[in-house]
Interface confidence: medium
C-alpha cells in the first residue's frame, strides 16, 4: 500500500468518523426539537429554565438537526463507499453553507445600522402587540427570554411597556410589565411573583394565560424590575462576548474549510487509486 493510498485511507476514515459524530449530534438536536414540539411541559421541567422561547427553538432545532444529519450523511456514506457524486454533493453543500456565512458576516458588518433599526422595529412591534395575538407568541416568548437572560426590560426603557394598553395601570392600579422583566435577585422574598402576578389576568383572556411567559406582573412603587433597556443590554452582551462569537464563527468556518478540502481531495484522488488498483488486478 503506497503512501498516497494510506493517506487517502486515513482521510476517508477521518471524514467518516467525524461525519458520523455530526450525524449523531444532528439526530440529537432533531430529537430535542421534536420533544419540545410534542411535549413542552416535560422539556421545561427537564431544562429547568424559565422564559424559554420554545415555539421558535423547537422549529430551529428540528430544521438544524435535519440539515446537520443530511450533510453528515452525505459525508459519511460518500467517504465510506468512496462515491464521488456524494462527496461532490457534500462539498457543494459545505461550500454553500460557507458562502452563506461569509455573506451574512459581510452584511452584518456593512449594514449594522439598518439591522439595528430593523431589530428595534421588530421589538417595538412585539411590545405594542404583546398578549393580544396568538400568532405572535413565538416573538413574545423570544423577547421574554432576551429580557430574562440579559436582565433588561423594554427596548430603551422599562417604560416602553407602558405604551401597551393592556399593561397600562388606571387610577390606583400599578402599571404592568411582563414577568420576564422582574429581577428576582433584587428581593429576598421568594413568593414575590405569587404576589405580583395579577389576579385580574382573566381580563386579558385565554391568550395571556395560555403560556407562562405571558404572565404579567404589577410594578410596585419601589419596583424590582430591571432598570436597563435591552438596547444597552444587547450592546453590553455583544461587547463582552465579541471574542467568543468571532472565535466560534472562525472555528466553524475553519472546520467547514477543512472538511471541504478533505472531501475534494478525496474526491479528486479516488480515480488515481482505482486506476492503480486496476493495473495490479
Amino acid at each position: 500500500m503506497s503512501a498516497q493510498e494510506s493517506c487517502l485511507s486515513l482521510i476517508k476514515y477521518f471524514l467518516f468518523v467525524f461525519n458520523l459524530f455530526f450525524f449523531v449530534l444532528g439526530s440529537l438536536i432533531f430529537c430535542f426539537g421534536i420533544w419540545i414540539l410534542i411535549d413542552k411541559t416535560s422539556f421545561v421541567s427537564f431544562v429547568g429554565l424559565a422564559f424559554v422561547p420554545l415555539q421558535i427553538w423547537s422549529k430551529v432545532l428540528a430544521i438544524s438537526g435535519i440539515f446537520t444529519m443530511g450533510i453528515a450523511l452525505l459525508g459519511c456514506v460518500g467517504a465510506l463507499k468512496e462515491l464521488r457524486c456524494l462527496l461532490g454533493l457534500y462539498f457543494g453543500m459545505l461550500l454553500l453553507l460557507f458562502a452563506t456565512q461569509i455573506t451574512l458576516g459581510i452584511l452584518i458588518s456593512t449594514q449594522r445600522a439598518q439591522l439595528e433599526r430593523s431589530l428595534r422595529d421588530v421589538v417595538e412591534k412585539t411590545i405594542q402587540k404583546y398578549g393580544t395575538n396568538p400568532e405572535e407568541t413565538a416573538a413574545e416568548e423570544s423577547w421574554d427570554y432576551v429580557q430574562f437572560q440579559l436582565r433588561c426590560c423594554g427596548w430603551h426603557y422599562p417604560q416602553d411597556w407602558f405604551q401597551v394598553l393592556i399593561l397600562r395601570g388606571n387610577g390606583s392600579e400599578a402599571h404592568r410589565v411582563p414577568c420576564s422583566c422582574y429581577n428576582l435577585s433584587a428581593t429576598n422574598d421568594s413568593t414575590i411573583l405569587d404576589k405580583v402576578i395579577l389576579p385580574q389576568l382573566s381580563r386579558l383572556g385565554h391568550l395571556a394565560r395560555s403560556r407562562h411567559s405571558a404572565d404579567i406582573c404589577a410594578v410596585p412603587a419601589e419596583s424590582h424590575i430591571y432598570r436597563e433597556g435591552c438596547a444597552q443590554g444587547l450592546q453590553k452582551w455583544l461587547h463582552n462576548n465579541l471574542i467568543s462569537i468571532v472565535g466560534i464563527c472562525l472555528g466553524v468556518g475553519l472546520l467547514e474549510l477543512g472538511f471541504m478540502t478533505l472531501s475534494i481531495f478525496l474526491c479528486r484522488n479516488l480515480d488515481h487509486v482505482y486506476n492503480r488498483l486496476a493495473r495490479y488486478r
Epitope: 445600522a113 439595528e116 427596548w155 430603551h156 426603557y157 405604551q163 397600562r168 395601570g169
Partner: antibody
Framework: QVQLVQSGAEVVKPGASVKVSCKAS????????MYWVKQAPGQRLEWMGY????????TYNQKFKGRVTITRDTSASTAYMELSSLRSEDTAVYYC????????????WGQGTLVTVSS | DIQMTQSPSSLSASVGDRVTITCKAS??????VDWYQQKPGKSPKLLIN???TRHTGVPSRFSGSGSGTDYTLTISSLQPEDFATYYC?????????FGQGTKLEIK
C-alpha cells in the same frame, strides 16, 4: 454621557428666518427622536415638532406648519430647526430634546437657544 | 387639541412641606403624562413619565399618580433645591401640549 449642545443666541429681523442646530453625543443619534420645544418669555412650553433621525420622518405642530422645518445630518449627529417668516412673537428660547419614540417623554434636553426677533 | 390645565399657578411652601400639584386634561389621556421641573435660566428636566414612573436619578420624594383626565405630582418633603417651576405634558395625541406651569416659591 448623553449631551445635546445647541448653537448660540441669535438676533434676527422680522420676516427673516433662523436655523438652530443641536449636536447630540453620548448615544446612538438615529435611535432617538429629536423634539423641538419653544418657550416664549412668561409663556408655557410649546411643542413644535420632532424628527426621526433614522429616516428623516417629521411630525409638526399644525400651529407652526409651513414655517418650521426640522432636518438632520446623521453623519454629524446634528438636528436642525429652521423657522421662517419670523415675527416678534417668535422671540423665545428654543430647546431640542431627545425622546425614544414620538409619543414618549423627553429625557434629555439641550441648553436652549435664545432667538430675538427685533428690527 | 388637548388642553392641560395646571393648578395652582403659583404656590408658596416651606422646606419639609408636602406639596401637591394637579393637572387636568380636557379629555382622557390614558396615563400618557410627564412632569418636568425647570429652574430659572435652565432647561427642563424630566421627573415623572407615564403618570407615575420616576425617571432615573429622580429622588423618591417625587411621585406621580392619576388616570383618565386627572393627574397629580406630589413632593413628600420639600427640599431647598425643589423650588422651581413644574410643568405637566400629555403625549397621548399630537399636538403634544403642556400645562401653563406651577411656580413653587419659598414661603
Amino acid at each position: 454621557q448623553v449631551q445635546l449642545v445647541q448653537s448660540g443666541a441669535e438676533v434676527v429681523k422680522p420676516g427673516a428666518s433662523v436655523k438652530v442646530s443641536c449636536k447630540a453625543s453620548g448615544y446612538s443619534f438615529t435611535d432617538y427622536n429629536m423634539y423641538w420645544v419653544k418657550q416664549a418669555p412668561g409663556q408655557r412650553l410649546e411643542w413644535m415638532g420632532y424628527i426621526d433621525p433614522y429616516n428623516g420622518d417629521t411630525t409638526y405642530n399644525q400651529k407652526f406648519k409651513g414655517r418650521v422645518t426640522i432636518t438632520r445630518d446623521t453623519s454629524a449627529s446634528t438636528a436642525y430647526m429652521e423657522l421662517s417668516s419670523l415675527r416678534s412673537e417668535d422671540t423665545a428660547v428654543y430647546y431640542c430634546a431627545r425622546s425614544p419614540y414620538g409619543h414618549y417623554a423627553m429625557d434629555y434636553w439641550g441648553q436652549g437657544t435664545l432667538v430675538t426677533v427685533s428690527s | 387639541d388637548i388642553q392641560m390645565t395646571q393648578s395652582p399657578s403659583s404656590l408658596s411652601a416651606s422646606v419639609g412641606d408636602r406639596v401637591t400639584i394637579t393637572c387636568k386634561a380636557s379629555q382622557d389621556v390614558s396615563t400618557a403624562v410627564d412632569w418636568y421641573q425647570q429652574k430659572p435660566g435652565k432647561s427642563p428636566k424630566l421627573l415623572i413619565n407615564w403618570a407615575s414612573t420616576r425617571h432615573t436619578g429622580v429622588p423618591s420624594r417625587f411621585s406621580g399618580s392619576g388616570s383618565g383626565t386627572d393627574y397629580t405630582l406630589t413632593i413628600s418633603s420639600l427640599q431647598p433645591e425643589d423650588f422651581a417651576t413644574y410643568y405637566c405634558r400629555q403625549h397621548y395625541s399630537t399636538p403634544f401640549t403642556f400645562g401653563q406651569g406651577t411656580k413653587l416659591e419659598i414661603k
